[in-house]
Amino acid sequence: HTAAQDNCTCPTNKMTVCSPDGPGGRCQCRALGSGMAVDCSTLTSKCLLLKARMSAPKNARTLVRPSEHALVDNDGLYDPDCDPEGRFKARQCNQTSVCWCVNSVGVRRTDKGDLSLRCDELVRTHHILIDLRHRPTAGAFNHSDLDAELRRLFRERYRLHPKFVAAVHYEQPTIQIELRQNTSQKAAGDVDIGDAAYYFERDIKGESLFQGRGGLDLRVRGEPLQVERTLIYYLDEIPPKFSMKRLTA
């Protein structure tokens, strides 16, 4: 199904405009900002979501140490260029002709340049580390319960195949979720780890992208998991190219 037929809405993306103008009067939904048709049975790509967001009115287990090549999205929001399939274009430019290269999750991976900057290919982000700190609780969460509930969340809410959730680490109060997905592993129809991570990030911040009540209520054995801080690290298949000046700053 492409959308909820009864009231013609998109269950997986509230930032859409839907109308029964599809083939045979079927409900069809288009992303705000780009006007691209979206498949409401799965997650919408992060590129289209960012574009929609910019167009909307303003309102003994050890934790993983991110590698030296891990990227953090420090640049924040921008209005991206998306390709016809909704993916980020390798080169992004702003209105003042400043350009940079991005990875498959839209995070800058080079220094900024001018219109002459070349980005030969869209480099895939194959490893995402989601680092969370939860609010103090009476006791630590049981690690296996936490692991099971987070895996269930990614499988059922974000429709991410379980094989792409590589690990869930826990050292109270820090939780780390590792997502891994190489180009060769991702089959047609598979949800991209970058899209799943973005939906999760928005959910955790109380800005759910799903149609409906607008909040994520994540519980481990009945106790709400309240996240105080979120950091997301992105690792690309090819290391990023930044000047030494940035690396020493």
Epitope: A148, E156, G215, D217
Partner: antibody
Framework: QVQLKQSGPGLVAPSQSLSITCTVS????????VNWIRQPPGKGLEWLGV???????NYNSALMSRLSISKDNSKSQVFLKMNSLQTDDTGMYYC?????????????WGQGTLVTVS | DIQMTQSPSSLAVSAGEKVTMSCKSS????????????LAWYQQKPGQSPKLLIS???SRESGVPDRFTGSGSGTDFTLTISSVQAEDLAVYYC????????FGGGTKLELK
């Protein structure tokens, strides 16, 4: 569509146990939790306990020693068992589904089972 | 355990009147991360199962008339009916889900 149908005896003798079954359709018990709530005649609602999607349970602390909730995912059934009933356990007993990650709200309720302890 | 206190316990109104009822919790129901409150409002008409009206303290459920408004944060919450209709006569319950679940004692809405 989502439905919860309850079945169980209407009359229970004092000191005996109560067993009610909630049979669900339109959703899977591996994806949604099911709660039990009761309401004495002319009184308010009292939460009894919950069977979470993952199989764990939580109970009202005041009633924990007398309550047991279990489920059979393959049969789409959740079971409430309550021991040592007294006359003040008389009332309507409901099962209700929570909304999974959209919030522990009870958006779908069973029709209720009237239990009389006499 | 979190206690929920509703007031008044009953309320006699005329059709068209504006009505407000209060719900107070013994501790804050606010999730500071998502800025959402774990509070819901239910409506129960005689002989019927309760019906969910409001979730997250202020999110109206699909199909609920817009004369119903939930507000408040932390420990103090309010349900307002802007213009009471005959079909609104019922008992209204608040419920916390911050730490398992507790219902308030209810507010009964009656016709004057």
């Amino acid at each position: 569509q989502v439905q919860l149908k309850q079945s169980g005896p209407g009359l229970v003798a004092p000191s005996q146990s109560l067993s009610i079954t909630c049979t669900v359709s339109g959703f899977s018990l591996t994806s949604y939790g099911v709660n039990w709530i009761r309401q004495p005649p002319g009184k308010g609602l009292e939460w009894l306990g919950v069977m979470w999607a993952g199989g764990s349970t939580n109970y009202n602390s005041a009633l924990m020693s007398r309550l047991s909730i279990s489920k059979d995912n393959s049969k789409s059934q959740v079971f409430l068992k309550m021991n040592s009933l007294q006359t003040d356990d008389t009332g309507m007993y409901y099962c209700a589904r929570d909304e999974n990650w959209d919030g522990a709200w009870f958006a779908y309720w069973g029709q209720g089972t009237l239990v009389t302890v006499s | 355990d979190i206690q929920m206190t509703q007031s008044p316990s009953s309320l006699a109104v005329s059709a068209g009147e504006k009505v407000t009822m209060s719900c107070k919790s013994s501790q804050s129901l606010l999730n500071s991360g998502t800025r959402k409150n774990y509070l819901a409002w239910y409506q129960q008409k005689p002989g019927q199962s309760p019906k969910l009206l409001i979730s997250w303290a202020s999110s109206r459920e699909s199909g609920v008339p817009d004369r119903f408004t939930g507000s408040g944060s932390g420990t103090d919450f309010t349900l307002t009916i802007s213009s009471v209709q005959a079909e609104d006569l019922a008992v209204y319950y608040c419920k916390q889900s911050y730490n398992l679940f507790t219902f308030g004692g209810g507010t009964k809405l009656e016709l004057k």
